[in-house]
Each structure stands twice: as C-alpha cells, then as structure tokens.
C-alpha cells in the first residue's frame, strides 16, 4: 500500500492585511480513517487553527467540500488576516482513535503578513528653545510588516541628515514598529516652518505616509525692546513709547515702572501677525513734565512666555523742560491708569 | 439524490443462506466506507459489518466466520453474504453509508427483513 | 468491546419540553459518538456527529455534547414529530456500539 503523504506545495504565502489567505493542502489517500486538522506552528505549543472534525473557527473556511468523500483537498481559507496570524502553518492528518493518533503532517506553508504602518506620528520638544538652539523631534509609526521601510525627515521641503532611527523588534516578528529622532537647528524665521516625516513600506504602493509638527510648537522668538520719547507736546507732556518687536508666541506682558514703581500692566492680545509669524506690540505713556521736581526713570518691563523679564529703561529730564506756575501740585486724574503718567498701547 | 436501497431478505431455514444486496445511487459506493447494521424485532440496533474503501472488512463478534461482506463496483452495489444463519439473525438489515473522514454512519436505506424460521 | 449505556431506558414528556438523553461509554471513545432517532416501522435517521455536529437538515432544537466518556442529547422543546426511540453510538473503534435505546413517548 502506498504511503501517505501531506503535500502542501506553497512554502510561504504573502497576504495583505484585511485579505484572505489560502492554505493549501492535498492528502495522497483518504486511508486511514481519520480527521485532517490545521495548526500555527510545531511541538506541543501549537496552535489549533482548524478541524473538520469539531469545534467553531468562524475565520476559516474550507475551499473544498469537505464532505465529499473523493476529495481529497484539505485546503483552508483564513479570512481578515492581520498581522497576528503570520507563522508557519501545518496540515495535519490524523487516525481515528481515542485520542486522534497523528499519522503525517505536510512540510507547512509560512504565512507573512503585508501590513501598513500607521501615520507617523512627529512630536517635537516639551518645552520651548530659542533661535540657534538644536531641538529633538521625533517620529513614530507601527504595525508595519515585512520589516524593511524607509524614512525620511524634511524640514519646509528639505531633506534633513541628522537623524537617528531604530526598527524594532530586531528579530522576526508578526509586525514592527519604526522610531526616528531628527535633530533640527532653529532660526528666528522658524515660526512657520514644519518639519515632515516620511515613511515608505512595500504596503503603501509608492505613496508614502507623512507625519507633520510645527516649528511654531517648539521655537520662542524672544522680542526685542526699545524705548523712544517723542518731542514735547505744548502741554508739557512727553509720550514715551515702548516697542516690542518680533518675537513668538504671542503670551507678553509689559509692566511699566516709574522710578521703580509700577505704573501699568498690559497683556499683549489679538496681535496682528508679521510675515515671518512673529508679533509687534507697541506701548506709550504721557509724562507730566510739570507735576515732577526731578528726573523720572521709566522702565519699561517684558516678560516674555513665561521666561525671566527684560527691562528697558529711559529716563525723562525734568530740568529740561520750564515748569509752569503751580505745576508742582498734583494733576488733575483724566481716566484710569493715570498718574501725572499717561500711557497707551498699541 | 442519495440514496440507498436494500433487497434479497426474506424467510430462510436455519443453517441457510441468503445474500443481500444494496444499491447505492447519487455517489460513489467504493469512496465510502459502508457498513450494514440489523435490528431484531423489538430490540435495539446491532451493528454487523464494514468494509473500508481499500477493501478492508470488518465483523461483529456473532456473525464472524459466517457472513461476507463485499462489494461490486462496476455495480455501484454493496453485498453481505450470510451462511449458517440462526434464529437470532432474524432482523431488518439496514445498509449504511460511513462519513467521509471519520465514518460516521450518515446515509440509511430503508431496510430489508430477514428471517431465519423452521 | 466498547459498552455503550443509555439513560433512562424510557421518558414521557409533553409538547414544548426540553428533554435530555445521556450516554456513557466503557471507556474513552474521544468525541467519536453519534445520535440518531427512529420512529416505529422506520430506517433511524442520524443527528448527530462528533458528538455535537449537527447533520445537515437536523434542526438546531437538536444538541449533543459531551467527550470522553459522558455524552447527553438534548431537545429544547418537543414536538409531536419528536417523539421517537433515540440510540447513540460509539465509532472509534471497531466493532461499532449502540447504545440499548431511550424511547421517548408523550405525556
């Protein structure tokens, strides 16, 4: 009599994830009696995938009838395959008994997985870094299977160098995950700038996968400060300004202090945008000359998103401006916020 | 359709012979295992005979040495020869078809009544 | 050979019912058992295989379980047409055994 043999004629199927895969497996003889059953790997860990015999494996099908007495096609179809099915599947062939005796397995059919890997995710730097600094972004896409992809970093457009990435885990598994960490050299002009991260897989048919961040998540443009007085007025008032130029983000608020003291306190807002993304605020006061015997040091002061304050000071000569009779008595308050000072913004 | 249909019971002394046939028709009898089983009147069901698709046969304790199974499959037809036969062979012979792969009994014919009286 | 016992030997039940039927083996016979029902004058009909597989068009109100040794069919509500006498059956080895039989009669 001749032998039994268990022929599964594919060594390995490649699937995409969400599709079928076909299994297939013919037997030579249909003696002796007894089941056919599928397995996920070999030795006494395997895993039971189908049996004829028993049991409910809603995923899988037989291609053919099996309840044909000549056949003797013990092919299976797995459906909605993802990456957890991908192993080395065994058709087995059993003799009855108690329990099922296995007689012959075939050489297996390994299954790999075509899966696409998730968006890339970019995160950039938990806190802010100003221009020249270097800040860290990174990349993060999953499972993704086979193992091999490309990355790449652009920054506005431009292929970016300085970067490092690890595909993990090193050795064979059902599906992978990809790590990258591109380093980026801010400038003042940053705010509108985006760094991309471009993953290429097999899966994506040559349209890769992209992951953005804005620079403006990661950059403080600290602003710069200048302290003008315009001419006199005919009243005896001088206007002294306070301008804040060019910095990101929009969060500032400007004290002004007269000789030391507070006078006001402003919180920048609804700033409208300069082309490069950065914002300019200006701030004025009205000095009484006359109300003051003595020079009056103005000091303008930002605190700029939550960094250390920045002081501009700028002092007012009294001497030089002829006072006039009883301009030594306090002036008369004209609205809020007004102390023999004036002030405004804008 | 599938079916199975058996013939050649009848009455027959003891120590007689009979031969019962069963046809089979909508598949192929030589790709099935097939069995026959009996029922004495009034009692429970007896399992006889069996041969497997590579000509295999197989016999129950009382009737071994006495009966043949066989089969023709020009004629797509199964045979159980019985010799010797005795008073407690009298029973309905039922022609079954075995399953596919584990041979469990799935097709019956209808049955023929042999009898074994003086 | 392979005892097959049946219990109980004879059940009356009425209409809408649910009845169960046990079977034990002498010894381990895997999950190779099979029901089958037959009526008075009538071939037996098969039910069951495997233990808990269904014949094509036996309905689902039929349901076996069981490995090993014990085995039960159950019946989740009765009908007229159900009232038959039940055998099980061990396949695993040869010679093949049915149980006595569970006749199953009306209230």
């Known amino acids: 009599e001749e032998e039994l043999q268990v022929i599964q004629p594919e060594k390995s199927v490649s699937v995409a994830a969400g599709d079928s895969a076909t299994l297939n497996c013919t037997v030579s003889s249909l003696i002796p009696v007894g089941p056919i059953q599928w397995f996920r790997g070999a030795g006494p860990g395997r895993e039971l995938i189908y049996n004829l015999k028993e049991g409910h494996f809603p995923r899988v099908t037989p291609v053919s009838d099996p309840t044909k007495r000549n056949n003797m096609d013990f092919s299976i179809r797995i459906s909605n395959i993802t990456p957890a099915d991908a192993g080395t599947y065994y058709c087995v062939k059993f003799r009855k008994g108690s329990p099922d005796v296995e007689l012959k397995s075939g050489a297996g059919t390994e299954l790999s997985v075509r899966a696409k890997p998730s968006a890339p995710v970019v995160s950039g730097p938990a806190v802010r870094a100003t221009a020249e600094h270097t800040v860290s972004f990174t990349c993060e896409s999953h499972g993704f299977s086979p193992r091999d992809i490309t990355l790449k970093w652009f920054k506005n457009g431009n292929e970016l160098s300085d970067f490092q990435t690890n595909v993990d885990p090193a050795g064979k598994s059902v599906s992978y995950s990809i790590r990258s960490t591109a380093r980026v050299v801010l400038t003042r002009r940053d705010v509108h700038s985006q760094v991309i991260c471009e993953v290429a897989h097999v899966t994506l048919q040559g349209d890769p996968l992209r992951g953005t961040a804005n620079l403006s998540e990661a950059i403080r443009v600290p602003p710069f400060l200048e302290v003008t007085q315009q001419s006199m007025r005919a009243d005896n008032q001088v206007n002294v300004t306070c301008q804040v130029t060019k910095f990101y983000p929009q969060r500032l608020q400007l004290t002004w202090l007269e000789n030391g003291n507070v006078s006001r306190t402003e919180m920048a807002s609804a700033l409208p945008e300069n082309k490069d993304g950065t914002y300019n605020w200006t701030s004025w006061l009205l000095v009484n000359v006359s109300a003051h015997r003595d020079d009056v040091k103005l000091t303008c002061q930002v605190e700029h998103d939550g960094q250390p304050a920045v002081n501009k000071s700028f002092s007012v000569k009294v001497s030089a401006h002829p006072k006039e009779q009883g301009s030594n008595t306090a002036a008369e308050n004209t609205g809020t916020n007004e102390r023999n000072i004036y002030g405004g913004s804008g | 359709e599938v079916q199975l249909v058996e013939s050649g019971g009848g009455l027959v002394q003891p120590g007689g012979s009979l031969r019962l046939s069963c046809a089979a028709s909508g598949f192929t009898l030589s790709s099935y295992d097939m069995h026959w089983v009996r029922q004495a009147p009034g009692k429970g069901l007896e399992w006889v005979s069996a041969?497997?698709?590579?000509?295999?046969?197989y016999y129950t304790g009382s009737v071994k040495g006495r009966f043949t199974i066989s089969r023709e499959n020009a004629k797509n037809s199964l045979y159980l020869q019985m010799n010797s036969l005795r008073a407690d062979d009298t029973a309905v012979y039922y022609c079954?078809?075995?399953?596919?792969?584990?041979?469990?009994?799935?097709?019956w014919g209808q049955g023929t009544m042999v009898t074994v009286s003086s | 050979d392979i005892q097959m016992t049946q219990s109980p030997s004879s059940l009356s039940a009425s209409v809408g019912d649910r009845v169960t039927i046990t079977c034990r083996a002498s010894?381990?016979?895997?999950?190779?058992l099979a029901w089958f029902q037959q009526k008075p004058g009538k071939a037996p009909k098969s039910l069951i295989y495997?233990?808990?597989s269904l014949h094509s068009g036996v309905p689902s109100k039929f349901s076996g379980s069981g490995s090993g040794t014990d085995f039960t069919l159950t019946i989740s509500s009765l009908q007229p047409e159900d009232f038959a006498t039940y055998y099980c059956q061990q396949y695993v080895s040869y010679p093949y055994t049915f149980g006595q039989g569970t006749k199953l009669e009306i209230k």
């Open positions: 041969i497997g698709t590579a000509g295999d046969t």
């Open positions: 495997t233990a808990s």
């Open positions: 079954v078809r075995g399953g596919v792969w584990d041979d469990a009994f799935d097709i």
């Open positions: 010894q381990d016979i895997n999950n190779y």
